[in-house]
C-alpha cells in the first residue's frame, strides 16, 4: 500500500490540458526529496518524463511542468496539448530513483467527439452481450487496438490490446480477432448494464493515421409482458434467458420498490406466501424454465422478473425477463374452500371446479411437494391409475355438466396434511389449490362398518352393514366398490329409511350391502358414504377379503348384520356378485407437454377412456343391498 496518492484514472480529449495532483505524507524528507513523473513501459521500466530536479523529456518539451507544493504535501504535473499518444500508464513518485514511493496513474486521451454519420447502432437487452465490430486498414494491423467510451468530450478506454481493461468492465470486456482476419477486430462486452449505454469509439493505430469506428450502444430495460389473470386462477411465467446462463441458478422475483424479492429459485428458496401454490420447472438444457403459480390472490398483482445468477438472486448485468401481472377480481372461477379439515381415520370430500364448457376434459388431483423447485405428482385422474399408497382410499367422482368434480380421500392420517391441486387437461387457468389439514380424531367416526374384519366365502351370501348417525338421516346413503378408475355406486338397502321421519333411533340407522353368491372377483375395497345430490359427504372404507369354503365346515354367518339381512323379507337378495371392469388408464404425457411439473402416476396406457363413472352402476354385472 503506497503512501503516495493520486488519481487512478485520468481521462481527457485531444488538445486539452491535465493537472495531476499527487499527495505524499507530510514529512521533512518527503517535502524536499525528488518528485518525478514517468511513463511505464511494457518491459517494466518507467521512463522519466519530468522531475523536480529540472529534467524534462523531449516529448514533454514546451508543454509540461512539475510543481511541488511542500506546504500542502502535494506536487502537480501539468501536461498541455494532449494527443492520443499520451494515453498510457504512468507513475507519480518520490525518491532518487523511479523505484521509490510511487502511485500508478492511467491516462486516457481521446479524440474530440463528433457524432459521425457512420455510427453503427447496437441494441441489446440488459444482461446480454454485445459484439462491437471495429474495421481498420492494413497499415494498422500491428498497431494498438482499443475501445473507449465517450463521456462528455472525453473518451475513456474500456479495453485495449495491451490488456488494459477499465475496472467497470473487468471480466466483462474482451478484445479479440477472428481467424485470419487482418482488417477487423472485435470487442465483446457481456453482462450489459444500463450505464453501459452510450457512444463508443474503437481505434486501431495512433495519431492521424489511426482507423476509428463509432458505435452507439443502447441497453434496453426488459419491456414487461402484460398478463391479465382472474382471481383464483393460475399463471405461468415462461422464462427463456438463453444458453449462456443454462448452468446458472434461476429465480423468479417480485419487484418491491428498488429491490426484487425472490419468490422461488432453483437453490430451494421459496417465499412462504407462495407455499403450496408454486412450481418451478426446467424446460430444456438451454436455460428455459417456467414458474407456475396457482390460486392467484389480489395481492399477487405486480411486477415480476425472472433471471439467472449463480447466487439464485437478482444481480445487475445478468439477463432478465419481466412481466406485469394484473389480477382481475371479477373472476369466472368460483370461490372454493382453500382449507379443508379432516380427522385421522375420517374422510374429506374436495370439490374441484373446472370450466363447465370443458366437461369432457380429463380431471386430475395432485399432491404438491415442497422439495427443491416444488412438484405435483398426480394421485388420481379420470385416466390415471391411483398412485401407490392411495389404493382403496382415493377416488375421483366426475359430475359432467356441473362444472365440478369431487375427490374423496378417506382413512386419513396426519401424513395426508398438505397442499393438493385440482387440474384438468383443458383450461389451465382452472387450477385450484387446497390445503388439507388432518388433526387427530377425538371421537368415533360418524360412519362405522360391521363386521370390521370382513371375509366373505365364495358361493355364500355375505352382508356388510354401515351404521350412520341421525344427522345423516335425510341424506342419500350409498355403497360403492372401489377400483382404480373410481368408486362405482352399487344398489343398497337403507334400513333406517323405513322409520318415521319424526323419530330417529341412533342404533338402528343402517345401510347394508349383500353379495350373493360371493365370487372371487368381489374381493376388494368397498366404501360406505353419504351424499346429497351431487354433493358428497363422509365416507368410510372396508376391505372385503374373499376365500374358498373349507371342506366340511358348516356355513356360519359371521355377523349380526348378516343375521338381520335374513330377517328382512322385503329385501331382495341379488343373485350375482359385484363385478369390476378394472380399466387401467395412464395420464397421457402429451397433456402436459408444457407442464411437466405435473407428474404422471400411472404406468399403463390405454387408448379408450375408462367407462365407469361414479353415480352409475354401469359396467357392473351384479349389485348389492
Amino acid at each position: 500500500q503506497s503512501p503516495i496518492f493520486g488519481p487512478q484514472d485520468v481521462s481527457s480529449i485531444e488538445g486539452n490540458s491535465v493537472s495531476i495532483t499527487c499527495y505524499y505524507p507530510d514529512t521533512s524528507v518527503n517535502r524536499h526529496t525528488r518528485k518525478y513523473w514517468c511513463r511505464q513501459g511494457a518491459n517494466g521500466y518507467c521512463a522519466t518524463l519530468i522531475s523536480s530536479n529540472g529534467y524534462l523529456s523531449k516529448e514533454y518539451s514546451g508543454r509540461a511542468s512539475l510543481i511541488n507544493f511542500p506546504e500542502n504535501s502535494t506536487f502537480v504535473i501539468n501536461i498541455a496539448h494532449l494527443t492520443q499518444e499520451d494515453t498510457g500508464s504512468y507513475k507519480c513518485g518520490l525518491g532518487t530513483t523511479n523505484r521509490g514511493l510511487f502511485f500508478d496513474v492511467s491516462l486516457e486521451v481521446s479524440q474530440v467527439p463528433e457524432f459521425p454519420n457512420d455510427t453503427h447502432v447496437y441494441t441489446k437487452d440488459i444482461g446480454r452481450t454485445v459484439t462491437i465490430e471495429c474495421r481498420f486498414k492494413e497499415g494498422n494491423a500491428h498497431s494498438k487496438k482499443s475501445l473507449c467510451k465517450k463521456r462528455g468530450e472525453a473518451c475513456e478506454v474500456v479495453i485495449d490490446s495491451t490488456e488494459y481493461v477499465d475496472p467497470s468492465y473487468k471480466d466483462r470486456a474482451i478484445l479479440f480477432m477472428k481467424g485470419t482476419s487482418r482488417d477487423i477486430f472485435y470487442v465483446n462486452i457481456s453482462h450489459l448494464i444500463p450505464s453501459d449505454a452510450g457512444l463508443y469509439v474503437c481505434q486501431a493505430g495512433e495519431g492521424p493515421s489511426a482507423d476509428k469506428n463509432n458505435a452507439d450502444l443502447q441497453v434496453l430495460e426488459p419491456e414487461p409482458e402484460l398478463l391479465y389473470k382472474d382471481l383464483r386462477s393460475s399463471v405461468t411465467f415462461e422464462c427463456d434467458l438463453g444458453r449462456e446462463v443454462a448452468n446458472d441458478a434461476k429465480y423468479l422475483c417480485r419487484k418491491n420498490k428498488e429491490t426484487c424479492d425472490v419468490i422461488i429459485n432453483t437453490l430451494g428458496k421459496r417465499d412462504p406466501a407462495f407455499e403450496g401454490r408454486i412450481l418451478l420447472t426446467p424446460r430444456d438444457d438451454n436455460g428455459r424454465f417456467s414458474v407456475l403459480i396457482t390460486g392467484l390472490r389480489k395481492e399477487d398483482a405486480g411486477h415480476y422478473q425472472c433471471g439467472a445468477h449463480s447466487s439464485g438472486l437478482p444481480q445487475e448485468g445478468w439477463p432478465v425477463q419481466a412481466w406485469q401481472l394484473f389480477v382481475n377480481e371479477e373472476s369466472t372461477i368460483p370461490n372454493s374452500r382453500s382449507v379443508v379439515k379432516g380427522v385421522t381415520g375420517g374422510s374429506v370430500a374436495i370439490v374441484c371446479p373446472y370450466n363447465p364448457k370443458e366437461s369432457s376434459s380429463l380431471k386430475y388431483w395432485c399432491h404438491w411437494e415442497a422439495d427443491e423447485n416444488g412438484r405435483c405428482p398426480v394421485l388420481v385422474g379420470t385416466q390415471a391409475l391411483v398412485q401407490e399408497g392411495y389404493e382403496g382410499r382415493l377416488a375421483l367422482f366426475d359430475q359432467p355438466g356441473s362444472g365440478a368434480y369431487t375427490v374423496i380421500l378417506n382413512q386419513l392420517t396426519t401424513q395426508d396434511s398438505g397442499f393438493y391441486w385440482c387440474l384438468t387437461d383443458g383450461d389451465s387457468r382452472w387450477r385450484t389449490t387446497i390445503e388439507l389439514q388432518v388433526a387427530e380424531a377425538t371421537k368415533k367416526p360418524d360412519l362405522e362398518v360391521t363386521p370390521q374384519n370382513a371375509t366373505a366365502v365364495i358361493g355364500e351370501t355375505f352382508t356388510i352393514s354401515c351404521h350412520y348417525p341421525c344427522k345423516f338421516y335425510s341424506q342419500e346413503k350409498y355403497w360403492c366398490k372401489w377400483s382404480n378408475d373410481g368408486c362405482h355406486i352399487l344398489p343398497s338397502h337403507d334400513e333406517g329409511a323405513r322409520q318415521s321421519s319424526v323419530s330417529c333411533d341412533q342404533s338402528s340407522q343402517i345401510v347394508s350391502m349383500t353379495l350373493n353368491p360371493v365370487k372371487k372377483e368381489d374381493e376388494g375395497w368397498y366404501w360406505c358414504g353419504v351424499k346429497e345430490g351431487q354433493v358428497y359427504g363422509e365416507t368410510t372404507a372396508i376391505y372385503v377379503a374373499v376365500e374358498e369354503r373349507t371342506r366340511g365346515s358348516p356355513h356360519i354367518n359371521p355377523t349380526d348384520a348378516n343375521a338381520r339381512a335374513k330377517d328382512a323379507p322385503e329385501e331382495e337378495a341379488m343373485e350375482s356378485s359385484v363385478r369390476e371392469d378394472e380399466n387401467k388408464a395412464n395420464l397421457d404425457p402429451r397433456l402436459f407437454a408444457d407442464e411437466r411439473e405435473i407428474q404422471n402416476a400411472g404406468d399403463q396406457a390405454q387408448e379408450n377412456r375408462a367407462s365407469g363413472n361414479a353415480g352409475s352402476a354401469g359396467g357392473q354385472s351384479g349389485s348389492s343391498k
Epitope: F5, P7, Q8, D9, V10, S11, S12, I13, N16, S17, V18, S19, I20, T21, Y23, N72, T74, R151, G152, E153, A154, E156
Partner: nanobody, 126 residues
Framework: EVQLVESGGGLVQSGGSLRLSCAAS????????VGWFRQAPGKEREFVTA??????????YYADSVKGRFTISRDNARNTVDLQMNSLKPEDSAVYYC?????????????????WGQGTLVTVSS
Amino acid sequence: EVQLVESGGGLVQSGGSLRLSCAASGRTFDQFTVGWFRQAPGKEREFVTAIRWSGSTTYRYYADSVKGRFTISRDNARNTVDLQMNSLKPEDSAVYYCAGQMSQWSDPRGDDYDSWGQGTLVTVSS
C-alpha cells in the same frame, strides 16, 4: 448551496453488487469533486472513492481496499455521480456518504468538502 442526496443503499449478500447514486440539486456538477465516504458502527469515517472533473477532463480516485471492485462514474444527463460496488464483502457494510467540494486542489480523501449528504446504509450479509 449544493444539496446532495444519496440513494441505492440496502441489504445485499456477500459477493453481490449494489449501485449508489449521489444526486446534486441547487447547481449542476461542474468543475467539482464528488467523493464517497463510509462509516461503519464504532469506526471512523473513511474515504472510498472520488471523481473530479474540469471541463472534459476527469480524474478518478480509489482507496486501496476498493480498487478493482468499485467504480465511480458521472452521469451528465441525470446530474448524478454513481458508485458501482461489485464483489461486496461484509467489511464493506457501513453508512455511505456522498460529499462535494469546489476546490480543485484539496485532497479528495480529506474532510474539507463543502457539502455532505445524509448517508445511505449498505449492509452486506455473509
